[in-house]
């Protein structure tokens, strides 16, 4: 079906990956579709096969080069097409002129580690992955801590309005198991969104010393 509601959304990870999701109400699940990328000022083009992620939604990753290579800049425009096979020919189902640095979503932060832990506080660091050098220090972070008996959705968000790849969590309970996550977002880009949350880092605060107030 071509008359259902259709949405074609893509994000650039700032280095060498464009991730796309296409949804089409009424489209057949077994339809063979792909995303084609055609830059306006580069000699390469790239294709990826859309794979189903839900009843009416497909996704794929355009791998533009080595993970840390800078394949696009702020002046690039990439024409992105969804093409679906109909019999012996391909039909264009969706199209957009994609401005990479207006549609950023970075990779989740990696290498989370506990730098120092005490009874009431914990210092945690992390690294950003595959982030363009163009950003310099123009990044922000959000972090959250999972306390016992709560859900991630209930966890208050801690905002770091600068490129700070560490945090000191305070007012923690002694001898308690916690989990910690962080995500990153460039300040640039009209349609830029937060990265996925990092893998959770589990840690335990130290027990209070015997005979001392906690």
């Amino acid at each position: 079906a071509v008359n259902g509601t259709s949405q074609f959304t893509c994000f650039y990870n700032s280095r060498a990956n464009i991730s796309c999701v296409w949804s089409q109400d009424g489209a057949l699940q077994d339809t063979s579709c792909q995303v084609h990328a055609w830059p306006d000022r580069r000699r390469w083009n790239q294709t990826c096969e859309l794979l189903p992620v839900s009843q009416a939604s497909w996704a794929c990753n355009l791998i533009l080069g080595a993970p840390d290579s800078q394949k696009l800049t702020t002046v690039d425009i990439v024409t992105l097409r969804v093409l679906c096979r109909e019999g012996v020919r391909w039909r264009v189902m969706a199209i957009q002129d994609f401005k990479p640095f207006e549609n950023l979503r970075l990779m989740a932060p990696i290498s989370l580690q506990v730098v120092h832990v005490e009874t009431h506080r914990c210092n945690i660091s992390w690294e950003i992955s595959q982030a363009s050098h163009y950003f310099e220090r123009h990044l922000e972070f959000e972090a959250r801590t999972l306390s016992p008996g709560h859900t991630w959705e209930e966890a208050p968000l801690l905002t770091l309005k600068q490129k700070q790849e560490w945090i000191c969590l305070e007012t923690l309970t002694p001898d308690t198991q916690y989990e910690f996550q962080v995500r990153v977002k460039p300040l640039q880009g009209e349609f830029t969104t937060w990265s996925p949350w990092s893998q959770p880092l589990a840690f335990r605060t130290k027990p209070a010393a015997l005979g001392k107030d906690t």
Partner: nanobody, 126 residues
Framework: QVQLVESGGGLVQAGGSLRLSCAAS????????MGWFRQAPGKEREFVAA????????VYVDSVKGRFTISRDNAKNTVYLQMNTLKPEDTAVYYC???????????????????WGQGTQVTVSS
């Protein structure tokens, strides 16, 4: 499938004007962008102009900017190409095309369009 019928072509002197029309029938509910292409003898078919479903976005090949105007009447399922200040190099068969593709680009190609008319001849004499 969508059926397209062009009209309005003909022989005109350089500097003159023509207005091409293209009437769509069939599965017109599936039409999004409508466009015009042209093909001169011995040359590849080239993009001329396109207009979005709502009519609020248009794009033209550089060589016709300021001379050609694309418009559409959704109630009549018709797209028009007003061609002014015609030049001998505008001589070609002009084709109307439609696409079901959702979205917009400034870089339309023949592959983006799935329904085509038979074409109408435009000849500009010097």
């Amino acid at each position: 499938q969508v059926q397209l019928v062009e009209s309005g072509g003909g022989l005109v002197q350089a500097g003159g004007s023509l207005r091409l029309s293209c009437a769509a029938s069939g599965r017109t509910f599936s039409i999004n962008t409508m466009g015009w292409f042209r093909q001169a003898p011995g040359k590849e078919r080239e993009f001329v102009a396109a207009i979005s479903r709502s009519g609020d976005s248009t794009v033209y090949v550089d060589s016709v900017k300021g001379r050609f105007t694309i418009s559409r009447d959704n109630a009549k399922n018709t797209v028009y190409l007003q061609m002014n200040t015609l030049k001998p190099e505008d001589t070609a068969v002009y084709y109307c095309a439609t696409t079901v593709a959702v979205g917009w680009t400034t870089r339309w190609s023949t592959i983006d369009f799935d329904s085509w008319g038979q074409g109408t001849q435009v000849t500009v004499s010097s």
